[in-house]
Amino acid sequence: NQDLPVIKCVLINHKNNDSSVGKSSSYPMVSESPEDLGCALRPQSSGTVYEAAAVEVDVSASITLQVLVDAPGNISCLWVFKHSSLNCQPHFDLQNRGVVSMVILKMTETQAGEYLLFIQSEATNYTILFTVSIRNTLLYTLRRPYFRKMENQDALVCISESVPEPIVEWVLCDSQGESCKEESPAVVKKEEKVLHELFGTDIRCCARNELGRECTRLFTIDLNQTPQTTLPQLFLKVGEPLWIRCKAVHVNHGFGLTWELENKALEEGNYFEMSTYSTNRTMIRILFAFVSSVARNDTGYYTCSSSKHPSQSALVTIVEKGFINATNSSEDYEIDQYEEFCFSVRFKAYPQIRCTWTFSRKSFPCEQKGLDNGYSISKFCNHKHQPGEYIFHAENDDAQFTKMFTLNIRRKPQVLAEASASQASCFSDGYPLPSWTWKKCSDKSPNCTEEITEGVWNRKANRKVFGQWVSSSTLNMSEAIKGFLVKCCAYNSLGTSCETILLNSPGPFPFIQDNIS
């Protein structure tokens, strides 16, 4: 076809000075020599469609997709990516070829896909297709461990599908409650994948590699313990393994344990029992309920019954997708300068979340604590009484959650002043937001009691610094006050603060600061 333009598609790889920081398109990046993507006409396509060679990009790399068009006259263009139109500004190079570019900075999964470029020239219309994918990178991960039964043995294997392969350890504790904290002397650690001693009070498996440490607790119902006020609940996703341990101690061996799901006995092969005598000659029995890969119909009340103990139940809920349940409405707090205070978020989530607290673009570690009612709580106390906006962000495999908090610190105003040739301005960040008065100091009013009301302009929130509101008041210069000292005062329920300014002075000239409680 004589009318078809000569088209060249190229890929330009940019070497970012730091691949871990996003760059704006104006950022000077070192470019490698362009790679020809050989735009070929796609056969059997409706319309004129050119297809560039597939582009593989490293995560965090920056690239430019570029089309050079040798066609007479002007061209107009439009980029389309995932059904969204993107701006397109063609320009001409020294050889008078039309140049159209798409810059992708700091490549991520979300930027992978098909980029369509529609070009309209005076002679014809045509489409160019680029397919951009992320290069098969190695993603080191650390995943929560899970349990499997060891073949032909009454033992549990702990598995964490992580890279590098993690160091696996069992964390065992035989006392109750607080004494089972990680560094307690009651805690025993065994650096092995298989555990045979399954009678302990508290059994956890932990996996660690250079990304951190993740633990999973063996869900246990203890028939000798008083049941919780709320029914224990266990969430699992379809396909995950289910493990519940029922434990009971009795003076002799004359008792048995059974599992039921919704009043029906568990099928053979979905449970196994172990028993042992303890040091005081009492009998300990444990009965495991397990399903190697759960389905929706495994949801329900699992009840462990004993011939010598009251039965106890747990609700197992199988979900298709993970979730994070919490109220995301923003919360505002007002505290005194030395008042102890923590932000807290109460949530129910599965799988376990990872979270961060952020203030002033700085992220802080986030700790979670499980509550008895199946909820978890995360608290943040390290605000150092800095007012502003605090953000809690949580995510797991399937869900994301963000909650905003505003912290206001009650304190009396601190005033800063500046003056120009035409006006004087005062600023204050006290809370509650202060009110303003302006006073003129003259022979008639040496104590500056003569109030100025004309030409005053108050702004309640001049600038918002990470949620911190600043109040300002501006006095426009008039002949009546030129050459005089004026005083601006900010006051709130906690006190007053003033600043004296000599008007008509060149540039900022704060004169005296008065702190009046």
Epitope: S60, L139, Y140, E210, D397, A399
Partner: antibody, heavy 129, light 107 residues
Framework: QVQLVESGGGVVQPGRSLRLSCAAS????????MHWVRQAPGKGLEWVAV????????FYADSVKGRFTISRDNSKNTLYLQMNSLRAEDTAVYYC??????????????????????WGQGTTVTVSS | EIVMTQSPATLSVSPGERATLSCRAS??????LVWYQQKPGQAPRLLIY???TRATGIPARFSGSGSGTEFTLTISSLQSEDFATYYC?????????FGGGTKVEIK
Amino acid sequence: QVQLVESGGGVVQPGRSLRLSCAASGFTFSSYGMHWVRQAPGKGLEWVAVISYDGSNEFYADSVKGRFTISRDNSKNTLYLQMNSLRAEDTAVYYCARGGEITMVRGVIGYYYYGMDVWGQGTTVTVSS
Amino acid sequence: EIVMTQSPATLSVSPGERATLSCRASQGVRNNLVWYQQKPGQAPRLLIYGASTRATGIPARFSGSGSGTEFTLTISSLQSEDFATYYCLQHNSYPLTFGGGTKVEIK
């Protein structure tokens, strides 16, 4: 540009201690795992230790476990290797190298790992009486 | 620990010829394997990660293959600057381990 500079090497007697430092620049140090690797004269490379991006986890080669400690100060963009109870077989050029970059993928923390992609020029440690 | 065995220890090749270097793991390491090049008096340089992906700026004549326990680094046409020692490293499990190295020298 991205750079790692080791220091602290020298001649030391067996049984004594030495601390190596590695100053990082040109990248967000706190987002990367960091490694120490050594090379005895005329021999191959030996991995020594790794520390996670936030300093919370360390792993060591069996030959140095219990004697060497890897640590980092993200506020100073510096990696350290504290070497105690030094032996003649610890004589080597010690390199620090950049590991994986931290990321969050659907609630799972991960590193995009391209191998140890940036290396320092090395610092020489000689253990001799 | 996983033992990485490289062969041959020395490879004599003429410029322009093909060089094939082997690295074997005592246990499977999936594709968690990296190749480095080192010249005398210099720090190692990353060539290949993920067993087969060329690092940024590495010429196309270098290619990696393999998975599990058997890995190969191929230099299709040796240039004068390619004469050096090559190391493989597994990072599938701790401790990370290097192979003993293959020295590629001019024939």
